[in-house]
Interface confidence: medium
């Protein structure tokens, strides 16, 4: 499968460059004064963090003390209280709420830019294309606000941002100016740009929801690297539903469930639906401690 080759050759290409003694770029960025961008919610602007550790999950550590501490929650974009065990843990731990805010929040971090359905493009249309931090390159489409048209780009397979569409039509429907604006719920059969086969694709819609569930529920469906065609379900965080997709049998990401029920159980509970009058309809969800399978430092941190 070509996707594997793309990953491998990214490495070989670099090695070859050194062997040829051609100038290779140095990517040893200093961690000081570095900003990190995280997309956690379809309706919020990109979350900019002054420090990468602000993206780490709250870690109580292995010890048994009960100490009140604060951590920055990337889903709520707020500093929150948690109980620290007294040893180990990580840097996303602060003695006071003020210290947490100082280290991890910015003045504009919680500013919500409202979009009016049928009149304005969703905010994510204005984000720059972002390949993410992975290297499983696949063809995707993004809206280029400078040229006012959808364009093709290479997506690394994880993270990035919401200005990322599987098909050109999705991108055009949502972000390009047209006579009908963008379409809200188009479930046509479209060409899937990932595997070049005809599959039903759900069109992304301007978000009427907020998401506070596990991080992997926000990732796009990822077919993976192999050749199988297994029926799986992924959580589409834009429309708030579990949708079927074909899994190749290897690779991919955590947003991959063998049944719709399993998918709903894992992801639906984190969903909050917005209603037009500004109120919120909350779905039932237990506020139990989230155990995110992939550490935030591995999946969320993206150098600007």
């Amino acid at each position: 499968m070509i996707y594997t080759m793309k990953k491998v050759h990214a490495l070989w290409a670099s090695v070859c460059l050194l062997l040829n003694l051609a100038p290779a770029p140095l990517n040893a960025d200093s961690e000081e004064d570095e900003e990190h961008t995280i997309i956690t919610d379809t309706e919020l602007p990109p979350l900019k963090l002054m420090h990468s550790f602000c993206a780490f999950k709250a870690d109580d550590g292995p010890c048994k003390a009960i100490m009140k501490r604060f951590f920055f929650n990337i889903f709520t974009r707020q500093c929150e209280e948690f109980i620290y065990g007294g040893c180990e843990g990580n840097q996303n731990r602060f003695e006071s709420l003020e210290e947490c805010k100082k280290m991890c929040t910015r003045d504009n971090a919680n500013r919500i830019i409202k979009t009016t359905l049928q009149q304005e493009k969703p905010d994510f249309c204005f984000l720059e294309e972002d390949p993410g931090i992975c290297r499983g390159y696949i063809t995707r489409y993004f809206y280029n606000n400078q040229t006012k048209q959808c364009e093709r780009f290479k997506y690394g397979g994880c993270l990035g941002n919401m200005n990322n569409f599987e098909t050109l039509e999705e991108c055009k429907n949502i972000c390009e100016d047209g006579p009908n604006g963008f379409q809200v719920d188009n479930y046509g059969t479209q060409l899937n740009a990932v595997n070049n086969s005809l599959t039903p694709q759900s069109t992304k819609v301007p978000s009427l929801f907020e998401f506070h569930g596990p991080s992997w529920c926000l990732t796009p469906a990822d077919r993976g690297l192999c050749r199988a065609n297994e029926n799986r379900f992924y959580y589409n965080s834009v429309i708030g539903k579990c949708r079927p997709f074909k899994y190749s049998g290897c690779g991919g990401n955590e947003n991959n469930f063998t049944s719709k029920q399993e998918c709903l159980r894992a992801c639906k509970k984190g969903f909050i639906q917005r209603i037009s009058k500004g109120g919120l309809i909350k779905t039932k969800r237990k506020r139990k401690k989230q155990r995110v399978k992939i550490a935030y430092e591995e999946i969320f941190v993206k150098n600007m």
Partner: antibody
Framework: EVQLVESGGGLVQPGGSLRLSCAAS????????LDWVRQAPGKGLEWVAD????????LYNQKFKGRFTISRDQAKNSLYLQMNSLRAEDTAVYYC????????????WGQGTLVTVSS | DIVMTQSHKFMSTSVGDRVSITCKAS??????VAWYQQKPGQSPRLLIY???TRHTGVPDRFTGCGSGTDYTLTISSVQAEDLALYYC?????????FGGGTKLEMK
């Protein structure tokens, strides 16, 4: 054998129009996107536009959007480029190329057709 | 738009020489680079895609490499039939852009 054969080039006056065609054969037409790329005399290559043969979704180089229109006819296994409001600087050899999604590159090219814009 | 710069318009070589043609992108193109060969009066021919993968039928004396913004096409032992124009192209994002070309000629 994959073959892309362009036609429709020729001499046209500034402000005029021209429609280029590209007949594709030797592969399943709907399996690959098709692109137009041009090359001015003695100059480099310049990507113009791309089309998905199944649904007709198009991508353009912003430089040509509005004046040039890419289209296709599945029944005829053909690609087209409608060029309007032509200028002297549009003088070039226009190539039809098959865009292979797995490679993300243009793996087969036609022989090209020369468009000359001059009064 | 991403600008692809091939700093050498011409490169002189001899049969059997090793030659490296370089290409620099104006921003990180994440190894999404292809190389094409064009002989006089002919259409371009794909040699390399994804920076280092040889296209079907391309002799193994052609190798590509690079990452970030810097990419190189190397011909390990130049043959007479290799004298041509070589173009790099980024396929990271549209509009796809090409380098200005490097003409390989005999010394």
């Amino acid at each position: 054998e994959v073959q892309l054969v362009e036609s429709g080039g020729g001499l046209v006056q500034p402000g005029g129009s021209l429609r280029l065609s590209c007949a594709a054969s030797g592969y399943t037409f709907t399996d690959y996107n098709l692109d137009w790329v041009r090359q001015a005399p003695g100059k480099g290559l310049e990507w113009v536009a791309d089309i998905n043969p199944i649904n007709g979704a198009t991508l353009y180089n912003q430089k040509f959007k509005g004046r040039f229109t890419i289209s296709r006819d599945q029944a005829k296994n053909s690609l087209y480029l409608q060029m309007n409001s032509l200028r002297a600087e549009d003088t070039a050899v226009y190539y039809c190329a098959r865009y292979y999604g797995d490679y993300d590159a243009m793996d087969y090219w036609g022989q090209g057709t020369l468009v000359t814009v001059s009064s | 738009d991403i600008v692809m710069t091939q700093s050498h318009k011409f490169m002189s070589t001899s049969v059997g020489d090793r030659v490296s043609i370089t290409c620099k992108a104006s921003q990180d193109v994440h190894t999404a680079v292809a190389w094409y060969q064009q002989k006089p009066g002919q259409s371009p021919r794909l040699l390399i895609y994804w920076a280092s993968t040889r296209h079907t039928g391309v002799p193994d004396r052609f190798t590509g490499c690079g990452s970030g913004t810097d990419y190189t096409l190397t011909i390990s032992s130049v043959q007479a039939e290799d004298l041509a124009l070589y173009y790099c192209q980024q396929h990271y994002t549209t509009p796809y852009t090409f380098g200005g070309g490097t003409k390989l000629e005999m010394k």
